[in-house]
């Protein structure tokens, strides 16, 4: 195709006449705004086809694109066409009129678009503004096309000055439909409710502006529909929430609630489900076992823990020997009940630096208007053993006795042992265990007493040695669950002048 004048851009005078010619090897035609204006078509003797477009009495409205194309390109291998852009500077025409379609620009993704405000004069300075603001936006301008760039979801106008007159274009509206892959989250105010209470569920989608929510729920299957409410969360762009509210729940409302969300722009969808349980009345249930006998060590801190589930939230009280316990101001006792999940609770009693007086019968009671549960245990305070006395005596009978006295809780065990070879025992040789069954001629007598006020056992053990022929190191060891204590004494024969 050959076009004369070749362009690609021409500036013509207003009111003038201008002739455009296009020729080619097949029939050709001039097009303007997707239409064919009146033109003269001819075929020369050499087989060349031509079309002549005469533009008369030009005005600014003749500004724009002109195309020459093959009249019937079906038989041609190339869909060739030539473009020419003509400006007709005309002070009476500000911005060229737009089709309505050009004023409303719709997007579903971030992409470059053109705001097609065009003027008749390529020398004019054109600026782009948000409709609300005066500041010119730094967007490149092409006199043949307009402003091209990535635009926010805003309304825009173009401005230019013709002579001393400022001219505004129509407003252009950019609508961006926010779409992305769908990620649904569903939650309930409560997943357990009593009959007669309300069920309220929320389904939230982020990052999408246009979605459809569809709920499926037990009541729907029986044909009893509930109308959900959809709203847009304030201060959170593109957070859409659908709320399903079922007042006065029935037992039959127990089951799976599913929120299905679809977005038709890119055909995305996602769904999430949640289980709701409607109970006839409230409940309190203990979880796990707590032994009826619990232990704490004297002067150490001890936390006693009870795990239970309940609905509705219960009141929790602790008692010691039938007297109500509370957080002590001295910080010796701390009570706490915490919600570890919607219906699961952990109640803890912490005794700080346990004292003997804190032994006793403890009860935790959890209750509400529908149900109650209680759990009791005995708390025993364990006291490490102490050897309080180890003494040796020589009764007239000729035998020698060693007396060991100690205390502790639980009841201490007593172990007697001896070392004959004082140089090597107990480092190199183990001590010999003593008692009624040992090879020495010795007898053992042990008495145990429980002291109620101190809540501990006292052990008194007497070792009788029949004859001692050389110095002997006698050791008394007391042991219980929380410790051991040892003392030793040297026993010498009667014949020796010293002890």
């Amino acid at each position: 195709l050959v076009v004369t004048p070749p362009g690609p851009e021409l500036v013509l005078n207003v009111s003038s006449t201008f002739v455009l010619t296009c020729s080619g090897s097949a029939p050709v035609v001039w097009e303007r705004m997707s239409q064919e204006p009146p033109q003269e078509m001819a075929k020369a003797q050499d087989g060349t086809f031509s079309s002549v477009l005469t533009l008369t009495n030009l005005t600014g409205l003749d500004t724009g694109e002109y195309f020459c194309t093959h009249n019937d390109s079906r038989g041609l291998e190339t869909d060739e066409r030539k473009r020419l852009y003509i400006f007709v500077p005309d002070p009476t025409v500000g911005f060229l009129p737009n089709d309505a379609e050009e004023l409303f620009i719709f997007l579903t993704e971030i992409t470059e678009i053109t705001i097609p405000c065009r003027v008749t004069d390529p020398q004019l300075v054109v600026t782009l503004h948000e409709k609300k603001g005066d500041v010119a936006l730094p967007v490149p301008y092409d006199h043949q096309r307009g402003f091209s760039g990535i635009f926010e979801d805003r309304s825009y106008i173009c401005k230019t000055t013709i002579g001393d007159r400022e001219v505004d274009s129509d407003a252009y509206y950019v609508y961006r439909l926010q779409v992305s892959s769908i990620n649904v989250s569903v939650n309930a105010v409560q997943t357990v409710v009593r009959q007669g209470e309300n069920i309220t569920l929320m389904c939230i989608v982020i990052g999408n502006e246009v979605v459809n929510f569809e709920w499926t729920y037990p009541r729907k299957e029986s044909g009893r529909l509930v109308e959900p409410v959809t709203d847009f969360l304030l201060d959170m762009p593109y957070h859409i929430r659908s709320i399903l509210h079922i007042p006065s729940a029935e037992l039959e409302d127990s089951g799976t609630y599913t929120c299905n969300v679809t977005e038709s722009v890119n055909d995305h969808q996602d769904e999430k489900a949640i289980n709701i349980t409607v109970v006839e009345s409230g409940y309190v249930r203990l979880l796990g076992e707590v032994g009826t006998l619990q232990f704490a060590e004297l002067h150490r801190s001890r936390t006693l823990q009870v795990v239970f589930e309940a609905y509705p939230p219960p009141t929790v009280l602790w008692f010691k020997d039938n007297r109500t316990l509370g957080d002590s101001s001295a910080g010796e006792i701390a009570l706490s009940t915490r919600n570890v999940s919607e219906t699961r609770y952990v109640s803890e009693l912490t005794l700080v630096r346990v004292k003997v007086a804190e032994a006793g019968h403890y009860t935790m009671r959890a209750f509400h208007e529908d149900a109650e549960v209680q759990l009791s245990f005995q708390l025993q305070i364990n006291v490490p053993v102490r050897v309080l006395e180890l003494s040796e005596s020589h009764p007239d009978s000729g035998e020698q006795t060693v007396r060991c006295r100690g205390r502790g809780m639980p009841q201490p065990n007593i172990i007697w042992s001896a070392c004959r070879d004082l140089k090597r025992c107990p480092r190199e040789l183990p001590p010999t265990l003593l008692g009624n069954s040992s090879e020495e001629e010795s007898q053992l007598e042990t008495n145990v007493t429980y002291w109620e006020e101190e809540q501990e056992f006292e052990v008194v053990s007497t070792l009788r040695l029949q004859h001692v022929d050389r110095p002997l190191s006698v050791r008394c060891t007391l042991r219980n669950a929380v410790g051991q204590d040892t003392q030793e004494v040297i026993v010498v024969p009667h014949s020796l002048p010293f002890k």
């Epitope: 926010e152 979801d153 805003r154 309304s155 509206y173 609508y175």
Partner: nanobody, 116 residues
Framework: QVQLVQSGAEVKKPGASVKVSCKAS????????MSWVRQAPGQGLEWMGW????????KYAQKFQDRVTLTTDTSTSTAYLELRSLRSDDTAVYYC?????????WGQGTLVTVSS
Amino acid sequence: QVQLVQSGAEVKKPGASVKVSCKASGYTFISHGMSWVRQAPGQGLEWMGWISADNGNTKYAQKFQDRVTLTTDTSTSTAYLELRSLRSDDTAVYYCATHGGDRSYWGQGTLVTVSS
């Protein structure tokens, strides 16, 4: 908050008409115009027309000029799209959208299925 709530899905026979509503809340209805856009399966968004809620002035895309009527009811803050002489290629999701100047707001879409 601005919210546009559209009427439910419609199934129509070829040659029939459909009227889709779009109820606005959260802003002064007459202060903004309402655009209508549609998206046919597998296609992009196609602008159909715009109506000024203030004075009822309309702009239509040339393609729909003869078959579309846009109206508003300011007493209920509702905009309507009526499409006549339905054809199977009118099967699409129809959206209303308004522009608040600093961002646009969209209805949730209404699926119109045209099938014999």
